[in-house]
Interface confidence: medium
């Protein structure tokens, strides 16, 4: 069986900074290397906008949670038909292929299955799904996700969420 894990599920970065989304997998059949697929899905709700109106969000999310949907994350869980879905990159053996939308971007799959952005861009905020596919190993949980939130800094003032404190930017 395949078991896919994203060890750090939640990343906040500043625009143009690098970030790596880690993904690890274990599989019972190791005769052939699996295909690693990273997909992007836009947030079902706007993470950043919600942070500026917590009261209304509280009411809405509490109502959703009260419905008793196990493990429901309203930012992540919705039908693909109501959000943007793209393939970011795939890796088979040592060959990494970027999806059409990401051609020209400095993005790659490093290690076995880690997705690395050398520079984040405005449209990168969303949910990233790491999928590991093997024809020899079809059982198990072959997918896990991480949330990425890219926030900007204007010349006047940082575009921050309430409670954040901006530190020095690294080169």
């Amino acid at each position: 069986a395949i078991q896919v894990t994203v060890p750090d599920p939640y990343h906040v970065v500043i625009l143009f900074q690098p970030v790596t989304l880690h993904c690890t997998y274990q599989m019972s059949n190791t005769l052939t290397a699996p295909i690693v697929i990273w997909k992007y899905k836009s947030f079902c709700r706007d993470r950043v906008a919600d942070a500026f109106s917590p009261a209304s969000v509280d009411n809405q999310l509490n109502a959703q949670l009260a419905a008793g949907n196990p493990g429901y994350n309203p930012y992540v869980e919705c039908q693909d038909s109501v959000r943007t879905v793209r393939v970011v990159a795939t890796k088979q053996g040592n060959a990494v292929t970027l999806g059409d939308y990401y051609q020209g971007r400095r993005i790659t799959i490093t290690g076995n299955a880690d997705l690395t952005f050398e520079q984040t861009a405005w449209g990168d905020s969303g949910v990233y799904y790491c999928s590991v596919v093997s024809a020899q190993d079809l059982d198990g949980n072959n997918e896990a996700y991480a949330e990425l939130i890219v926030l900007g800094r204007t010349s006047e003032a940082p575009e921050l969420l309430p409670g954040f404190r901006a530190g020095p930017l690294e080169d």
Epitope: T5, V6, P7, D8, P9, Y10, H11, V12, V13, I14, Q17, P18, V19, T20, H22, R47, D50, A51, P54, V57, D58, L61, N62, G71, N73, Y75, V76, L161, P162, G163, F164, R165, A166, G167, P168, L169, E170
Partner: antibody, heavy 115, light 106 residues
Framework: AVTLDESGGGLQTPGGALSLVCKAS????????MNWVRQAPSKGLEWVAG????????DYGAAVKGRATISRDNGQSTVRLQLNNLRAEDTATYYC????????WGHGTEVIVST | ALTQPASVSANPGETVKITCSGG????????YGWYQQKSPGSAPVTMI???NNRPSNIPSRFSGSLSGSTNTLTITGVQADEAVYYC??????????FGAGTTLTV
């Protein structure tokens, strides 16, 4: 293996300042949020401060906000907590912890604030 | 703050469930962890992170699950697992928050 080693604890005087350092190894340090968590004697865990992988975001617990500064050196794989205007209630064991959903802890360093 | 029971008890071999609720209400509240502390002053050990992920050195009898806004640590077939178990979560922004701890008596 992931290891986190804290240092810098000891006896401190009220009103003074302390600097704790956590040295990390066994993983790509710059990819992970790092945190400081403390535990006062006979008390529970209290989140103190956090910093994201590239040093651009920091956040602090209410008890230390305005007195604490968290920073990191990704080249040296270290994260530092500076705590000023020390109070008796800062007496605790301070732990370094990795990740937004913490998956690894250091052994801790004990800080005693007393005259 | 996170809410968890002050204490639970079980006989060896029984299944124990410890619940944790009340994570950050609107931002980042969907990722919980469980941390075991065997004795005061000893370093916490991560039993579960990211809701249901178990570090490789943790026995498979420990598992985590998320249902609505409540996270549950399940210990199937309790052994010498007496300890204080803390739940933790992302509160708001990148800040963390912990429960007061649950003492498990076997």
């Amino acid at each position: 293996a992931v290891t986190l080693d804290e240092s810098g604890g000891g006896l401190q005087t009220p009103g003074g300042a302390l600097s704790l350092v956590c040295k990390a190894s066994g993983f790509t340090f710059s990819d992970y949020q790092m945190n400081w968590v403390r535990q006062a004697p006979s008390k529970g865990l209290e989140w103190v401060a956090g910093i994201n992988g590239r040093s651009s975001w920091t956040d602090y617990g209410a008890a230390v906000k305005g007195r604490a500064t968290i920073s990191r050196d990704n080249g040296q794989s270290t994260v530092r907590l500076q705590l000023n205007n020390l109070r008796a209630e800062d007496t605790a064991t301070y732990y370094c912890a990795r990740g937004s959903s913490i998956d690894a802890w250091g052994h801790g360093t004990e800080v005693i604030v007393s005259t | 703050a996170l809410t968890q029971p002050a204490s639970v008890s079980a006989n060896p071999g029984e299944t124990v469930k410890i619940t944790c609720s009340g994570g950050g209400s609107y931002y980042g509240s969907y990722y919980y962890g469980w941390y075991q502390q065997k004795s005061p002053g000893s370093a916490p050990v991560t039993m579960i992170y990211n809701n249901n992920n178990r570090p490789s050195n943790i026995p498979s009898r420990f598992s985590g699950s998320l249902s609505g806004s409540t996270n549950t640590l399940t210990i199937t077939g309790v052994q010498a697992d007496e300890a204080v178990y803390y739940c933790g979560s992302i509160d708001s922004n990148i800040a963390g928050v912990f429960g007061a701890g649950t003492t498990l008596t076997v």
